[in-house]
């Protein structure tokens, strides 16, 4: 939290590549890799929808919510067996991500 | 979208005291709640924080002082054995990687015989 | 334990510029908060990673760091900002996370 972002300096993330699928109805399936250069005790995650440094404890206990992964306004649920989460807007619309 | 601290009153030396802050029109599963305390004419003090999972981290000082809980749409801090020393406002706080952007009016703790 | 100092009073003429600072004792990793506190109301978040401002806050506010130094910077002082100044930022990660404030500036405007 409130860890230092910016250029590709220790903390910091980049994405690398973004591909989406929009080939099935009402469903778009985006896959992204991010670069990034955690400090120690850090790992890869997202915060608001971006690549971000997070802390290991958050990735080793699956509690993803912990990342704050989904943007202000979106409430956030972790998916049965911890694979991923997901993000509700308050339209009721709902974004799944999967980790893997 | 607001926070509200209740539960601030006048407590001997060693009774426990819960205070709550409740939140409106916002999900805790997207915010890091915080509770900071304020003694009369002081500064600030970050007490501790609680994550979506419920995880909570403590300054250093007040471990053991302090226990923070959550449910669906409030935030608890237990002062386990208050002092005269925790006289003070407590504030709850909304934050997330931009900082602590809402916070509550504060409720006031006396603590005195 | 990271310890953030800042001078405990500074005064400014109405209409001048004034930077109030804040030093970490360690190199600090992370980003600097500012909040401004007027008496009997809660703290307002002024500038957020060293130097965003959230939306409402007067451009007049801006946000700086170099080093263990950070600096808040009030442009145009007006009689409404007397308040207290406080800095924070976070400190550590995982089992060890802080968050700490400065002891806060009391700004007058004379």
């Known amino acids: 939290q409130f860890l230092k972002e910016g250029q590709l300096a220790a903390g910091t993330c980049e994405i690398v590549t973004l591909d989406r699928d929009s080939s099935q109805p009402r469903r778009t399936i985006a896959r992204q890799t991010a670069r990034c250069a955690c400090r120690k005790g850090q790992i890869a995650g997202t915060t608001r929808n971006k690549p971000s440094c997070v802390d290991a404890r958050i990735i080793k206990t699956k509690q993803w919510c912990d990342m704050l992964p989904c943007l202000e306004g979106e409430g956030c649920d972790l998916l049965i067996n911890r694979s991923g989460w997901t993000c509700t807007q308050p339209g009721g619309r709902i974004k799944t991500t999967t980790v893997s | 979208q607001s926070l509200e601290e209740s539960g601030g009153r006048l407590v001997t030396p060693g009774t426990p005291l819960t205070l709550t802050c409740t939140a409106s029109g916002f999900s805790l599963s997207t915010y890091y709640m915080s509770w900071v305390r304020q003694a009369p004419g002081k500064g600030l003090e970050w007490i501790g924080i609680?994550?979506?999972?419920?995880t909570t981290y403590y300054a250093n000082w007040a471990k053991g002082r302090f226990t923070i809980s959550t449910a669906s749409t409030t935030v608890d801090l237990m002062i386990t054995s208050p002092t005269t020393e925790d006289t003070a406002t407590y504030f709850c706080?909304?934050?997330?990687?931009f900082g602590y952007g809402l916070w509550g009016p504060g409720t006031l703790v006396t603590v005195s015989s | 334990e990271l310890v953030l100092t800042q001078s405990p009073s500074v005064q400014v003429n109405l209409g001048q510029t004034v930077s109030l600072t804040c030093t970490a004792d360690t190199l600090s990793r992370s980003y600097a908060s500012w909040y401004q506190q007027k008496p009997g109301q809660a703290p307002v978040l002024l500038i957020y990673?060293?130097?965003s401002r959230p939306s409402g806050v007067p451009d007049r506010f801006s946000g700086s760091s170099s080093g263990n130094t950070a600096t808040l910077t009030i442009s145009g002082a007006q009689a409404g900002d007397e308040a207290d100044y406080y800095c924070?930022?976070?400190?550590?990660?995982?089992?060890?996370?802080?968050?700490?404030f400065g002891g806060g500036t009391q700004l007058t405007v004379t």
């Open positions: 924070a930022t976070s400190d550590g990660s995982g089992s060890n996370y802080q968050y700490v």
């Open positions: 990673r060293d130097t």
């Open positions: 609680v994550y979506p999972s419920g």
């Open positions: 706080a909304r934050g997330d990687s």
